[in-house]
Interface confidence: medium
């Protein structure tokens, strides 16, 4: 669809006469009938397959022709056609003189004709104007002619519709050519496609309108670029969604089990040596002069009573001293300078003479030692603490302090690992002489049956289109994450694109 | 006053399909644009499928895929096919005329919204 258009700019007929020869009276009122039809190579009446218009009297004898409008015509003259322009046409522009004020053809005498012009030849559609004069005996009539398309309608033929717009159907412009051109955050052939935010992820995000980024599920964060980890997941990570790979130091589905109790609670004191030893379990190895569980007591060197034959122990900062009863000497009180005369033997001891007399020995009754009997027994030189308990004297008694996983007053007893329910997941308990074993059900493993193994949901690939599966550890069903272009709950189908414009 | 009436909706198992027909009483929409949209309990109205006078469509990312329109200017009549439906499609669907710059404006008398049809998709 088109318009050929016609602007007439001058008309010469300087001796006001007729095609005849006649002159008007009393002048030539000029009008112009204008006809344009298909090529022919000569031109020939017929019908003016293209068009016709007419103009009113545009002035008299020679007169130049404005702009605009004309005594109520149109310069330029409008052909409009609804076909595709073929790039040639035949034209015939015909001036007539005007009696009276009626132009109709049939009003007019025959001989009332002025000029009579034809020409044909190629043209293009476009917005330059091509320049014409022609010359008669007694007329010139100079003119310029083109041909543009209709509105919405473009190309070489005039033939391409097209419409901007911007609402659900499309976000466009038209090109001169009658392509598309997008506007600003749209994409796609008829422009319907927003562009996302820019970085969205390709697969795991989307968006319903330009520098938008929705996340599809099991994903997170501006870009959609990070996986959701499984619900409850404590100290995990995951690089698929609804994953939980634990930290290091953590274990359990949830990664909720402490394994690294040393590292995230620093329990041993006085700069001892912390070594894990199961889940919320740990061992410290105490520096020289401390003890306890987590060698949070000092040791003071008189604990082991090196001093003999009744000496008094006294702690100082480089060790200890030991203070001698009379009748003895050395480092620990150990040489005497006694006789059985002296009656050296406490606590009822029995006095042996030997080495003539130079020196003695005691002979103690139960309960006491000694080298005078002066001691009562160290109730923990016997080691009466099992499993490596440590032996503490509390006066006239003692106590033992067990280590972990044993119990009674010998630390004799061994605690049932079991007893904490150490299995996950109904995971059966097993007692051993050095720890536990678990028993899993069906769907777990690990050491603790921490680890699900259920049978994989994704295992029977039910995505299609390479579309990318997920195992919801929660609830055993897959999740399918569709390429572009594909939909459904497992990218079964692909996206219809609409019908394309009906031109 | 112009009438629309929608028809078509049903309770169908997940996967089926339904057609959805909507006409329009005492005017002829050939020029403007046709939409039909769908509302469920507790949840705004949303457009699911629109088609123009030109016949260019539009579906929500949702439906892409799944469900057609068409129109028939004739019988005064759009239609929505919509096939491997899901419980989430469960919802009332209306017809009516969704803005566009391309087609021209439903008449004023256009477009009071009809009773709708029930769609209900179970699992």
């Known amino acids: 669809s088109g318009v050929f258009q016609l602007q007439l700019q001058e008309f010469i007929n300087e001796r006001g006469v007729l095609a005849s020869g006649r002159p008007c009276e009393p002048g030539c009122r000029t009008f112009f009938r204008v006809c344009l039809k298909h090529f022919q190579a000569v031109v020939s009446p017929g019908p003016c397959t293209f068009g016709t218009v007419s103009t009113p009297v545009l002035g008299t004898n020679s007169f130049a022709v404005r702009d605009d409008s004309s005594g109520g015509g149109r310069n330029p003259l409008q052909l409009p056609f609804n076909f595709t322009w073929p790039g040639t046409f035949s034209l015939i522009i015909e001036a007539w003189h005007a009696p009276g004020d009626d132009l109709r053809p049939e009003a007019l005498p025959p001989d009332a004709l002025i000029s009579k012009i034809a020409i044909q030849g190629s043209l293009a559609v476009g917005q330059n104007w091509l320049l014409d004069e022609q010359t008669s005996t007694l007329t010139r009539l100079r003119y310029s002619y083109r041909v543009i398309c209709s509105d919405n309608y473009y190309g070489d033929n005039c033939s391409r519709l097209c419409k901007k717009r911007n609402d659900h159907f499309g976000h466009y412009v038209c090109q001169p050519d009658g392509n598309l051109s997008c506007l600003p955050g749209w994409t796609g052939e008829y422009c319907q496609q927003p562009i996302c935010l820019s970085g969205c992820h390709e697969q795991n995000g989307y968006c319903s309108k330009p520098a938008e980024c929705l996340c599809r599920p099991g994903w997170q964060g501006r870009l959609c670029n990070e996986c959701i980890p499984h619900n409850g997941c404590r100290h995990g990570t995951c690089s698929t969604p609804w994953q939980c790979t634990c930290d290091e130091g953590w274990g359990g589905l949830f990664c909720d089990q402490d394994l690294n109790y040393c590292t995230h609670h620093s329990p041993c004191k006085n700069g001892a040596t912390c070594s894990n030893s199961g889940q919320r379990s740990y061992t410290c190895t105490c520096r020289p002069g401390y003890t306890g569980v987590d060698c949070e007591l000092e040791l003071s060197e008189c604990d082991s009573n090196p001093c003999r034959n009744g000496g008094s122990c006294k702690d100082q900062e480089d060790g200890y001293h030991c203070l001698c009863p009379p009748g003895y000497y050395g480092l620990h009180c150990e040489h005497s300078t006694l006789s059985c005369a002296d009656s050296p033997c406490f606590n009822g001891g029995s006095c042996r003479e030997r080495n003539q007399g130079a020196n003695y020995a005691c002979e103690c009754p139960p309960n006491f030692t000694g080298s005078n009997c002066e001691k009562k027994v160290d109730r923990c030189t016997s080691n009466p603490c099992a499993n490596g308990g440590q032996c503490l004297n509390r006066g006239p008694s003692r106590m033992c302090r067990c280590r972990p996983g044993f119990t009674g007053t010998y630390c004799e007893l061994h605690v049932s690992d079991c007893a904490r329910n150490p299995c996950a997941h109904g995971g059966t308990c097993h007692d051993l002489e050095n720890g536990l074993m678990c028993t899993c059900p069906a769907g777990f493993s690990g050491r603790r049956c921490e680890v699900r193994t259920s049978i994989d949901a994704c295992a029977s690939s039910p995505c299609f289109n390479r579309a990318t599966c997920y195992t919801d550890l929660s609830t055993d069903t897959f999740v399918c994450n569709c390429p572009y272009g594909f939909v459904g709950s497992r990218c079964e189908f692909p996206v219809g694109l609409p019908p394309s414009f009906p031109w | 006053e112009v009438q629309l009436v929608e028809s078509g909706g049903g309770l169908v198992q997940a996967g089926g399909s339904l057609r959805l027909s909507c006409t329009a009483s005492?005017?002829?929409?050939?020029?403007?644009?046709m939409g039909w949209y769908r509302q469920a309990p507790g949840k705004q109205r949303e457009l699911v499928a629109a088609i123009s006078s030109d016949d260019s469509t539009y579906y929500a990312d949702c439906v892409k895929g799944r469900f057609t329109i068409s129109r028939d200017n004739a019988k005064n009549t759009v239609y929505l096919q919509m096939n491997s439906l899901k419980p989430e499609d469960t919802a009332v669907y209306y017809c009516?005329?969704?803005?566009?710059?391309?087609?021209?404006?439903?008449?004023?008398?256009?477009?009071?919204w009809g009773q709708g049809t029930q769609v209900t998709v179970s699992s």
């Open positions: 005492g005017s002829t929409f050939t020029s403007y644009a």
């Open positions: 009516n005329a969704p803005h566009s710059d391309y087609d021209e404006e439903a008449p004023s008398d256009f477009g009071s």
